[in-house]
């Protein structure tokens, strides 16, 4: 990896678990100011593999609300608005980091957690099963 | 919101910024043990809106490596394997949380940051702009 010289102004840590336990400022900096005006907000409806968004809420997690995509159909929508079963709607999944309160119900102590979320759906050609 | 009784075993914090600055254990807990065997790993190639994955690396960020999807075509792939420009390939974007070293180059001090990443692509019907 890349070795970075340590900043002498860093907070000190005598924690024996260092650097496993770190200080995190929860004042979120949002780098998405320059997002594309062509928002993906309506893609879920206009896609050939449309999806619905389901709210997943967990007060012990940060962020507490995550939206999960569920493909509306097993097939894909064609130009006539019919469902083609020679194509399949599948969820696009991504691993994301969240903060889990640990110990539970603690307001200022968390553990990093990786979860898999479905972000949207895409239309794919079916897998070819080669028979021996 | 939901009020949760505070666990008496929580770490103490006299920090004036509390609860803005919290302790986070970086030993990641992976909740994705039960992932679907139908892995989405080959969807980028089989999709009617295929995409390439580009590595985005930043040592000041945790995770330092993020993979960004870029749609291969402006149109979508039709049944003949040709690009159909009556439809559009568009990126599905998601806001994710990352940790940004703050002050820079500090190993144990971070700030939460929201970034927008493209996870994959989907094929959508284009928006028709009616001219008055």
């Amino acid at each position: 990896g890349i070795t970075i010289p340590r900043n002498p102004g860093c907070p000190n840590s005598e924690d024996k678990n260092f650097p496993r336990t770190v200080m995190v400022n929860l004042n979120i900096h949002n780098r998405n100011t320059n997002t594309n005006p062509k928002r993906s907000s309506d893609y879920y409806n206009r896609s050939t593999s449309p999806w619905n968004l389901h709210r997943n809420e967990d007060p012990e997690r940060y962020p507490s609300v995550i939206w999960e995509a569920k493909c509306r159909h097993l097939g894909c929508i064609n130009a006539d608005g019919n469902v083609d079963y020679h194509m399949n709607s599948v969820p696009i999944q991504q691993e994301i980091l969240v903060l889990r309160r640990e110990p539970p119900h603690c307001p200022n102590s968390f553990r990093l957690e990786k979860i898999l979320v479905s972000v949207g759906c895409t239309c794919v050609t079916p897998i070819v099963h080669h028979v021996a | 919101g939901i009020t949760i009784p505070r666990n008496p075993g929580c770490p103490n914090s006299e920090d004036k910024n509390f609860p803005r600055t919290v302790m986070v254990n970086l030993n990641i807990h992976n909740r994705n043990t039960n992932t679907n065997p139908k892995r989405s790993s080959d969807y980028y190639n089989r999709s009617t809106s295929p995409w390439n994955l580009h590595r985005n690396e930043d040592p000041e960020r945790y995770p330092s490596v993020i993979w960004e999807a870029k749609c291969r075509h402006l149109g979508c792939i039709n049944a003949d394997g040709n690009v159909d420009y009556h439809m559009n390939s568009v990126p599905i974007q998601q806001e994710i949380l990352v940790l940004r070293r703050e002050p820079p180059h500090c190993p144990n001090s971070f700030r939460l940051e929201k970034i927008l990443v493209s996870v994959g692509c989907t094929c959508v019907t284009p928006i028709v702009h009616h001219v008055a």
Partner: antibody, heavy 118, light 113 residues
């Protein structure tokens, strides 16, 4: 082993509505779609529509749009089809059938006989 | 909508005879990406619901006797019973599941002489 259990025979008056049910047993309800098919001696087998309980999507045969409404209750693993403004033309045997991602409809319910008569 | 035409409408055969019924679609049911034909054959015995016999034009469902043979590709398909048995008395339907609305053939009634 998958099994689809349909509600019993119905005798209803013209102009009324009826809601037929189909309970899914022996498989994960949200992993498959539920198709509905009408059978009459005159028109044979006709596909009415499909619902995906996992994703909430529905698709209908144009012929049955406005006549049939498909819904699903995940908590009871039951699919429903409501038929409205009934006429004698709606008298038929109605089947629910499980569909996979290829559109294969492998398991069929026993059928519900609907008679519309005054 | 895809139109499915089935012939003949009825057949009377003796036990042990070979029987073939046909099904035509007005557009191809072949998916070039996986080389599968999205065509199914169903058997419906009197008073029962349809039972899936063959799918993807030629794949026999588990538990279906091997005397039932599906064949064909694109728009022309057939179901052959190599040696008819008394219990094969039924209506036989073809169905396309390539795209909605799914459509069925009008059926072939098999009678046993």
């Amino acid at each position: 082993q998958a099994h689809l259990q349909q509600s019993g025979a119905e005798l209803v008056r013209p102009g009324a509505s009826v809601k037929l049910s189909c309970k899914a047993l022996g498989y994960t309800f949200t992993d498959y779609e539920m198709h509905w098919v009408k059978q009459t001696p005159v028109h044979g087998l006709e596909w009415i529509g499909v619902i995906h309980p996992g994703g909430g999507g529905t698709a209908y045969n144009q012929k049955f749009k406005g006549k049939a409404t498909l819904t699903a209750d995940k908590s009871s693993s039951t699919a429903y089809m409501e038929l409205s403004s009934l006429t004698s033309e709606d008298s038929a045997v109605y089947y629910c059938t499980r569909g996979d991602h290829d559109g294969r409809t492998d398991y069929w319910g026993q059928g519900t006989t609907l008679t519309v008569s005054s | 909508d895809i139109v499915m035409s089935q012939s003949p409408s009825s057949l009377a055969m003796s036990v042990g005879q070979k029987v073939t019924m046909n099904c035509k679609s007005n557009q191809s049911l072949l998916n070039r990406s996986n080389q599968k034909n999205y065509l199914a054959w169903y058997q419906q015995k009197p008073g029962q619901s349809p039972k899936l016999l063959v799918d993807f034009a030629s794949t026999r469902e588990s538990g279906v006797p091997d005397r039932f043979i599906g064949s064909g590709s694109g728009t022309d398909f057939s179901l052959t019973i190599s040696s008819v048995q008394a219990e094969d008395l039924a209506d036989y339907f073809c169905q396309q599941h390539y795209t909605t609305p799914f459509t069925f053939g009008s059926g072939t009634k098999l009678e046993i002489k």
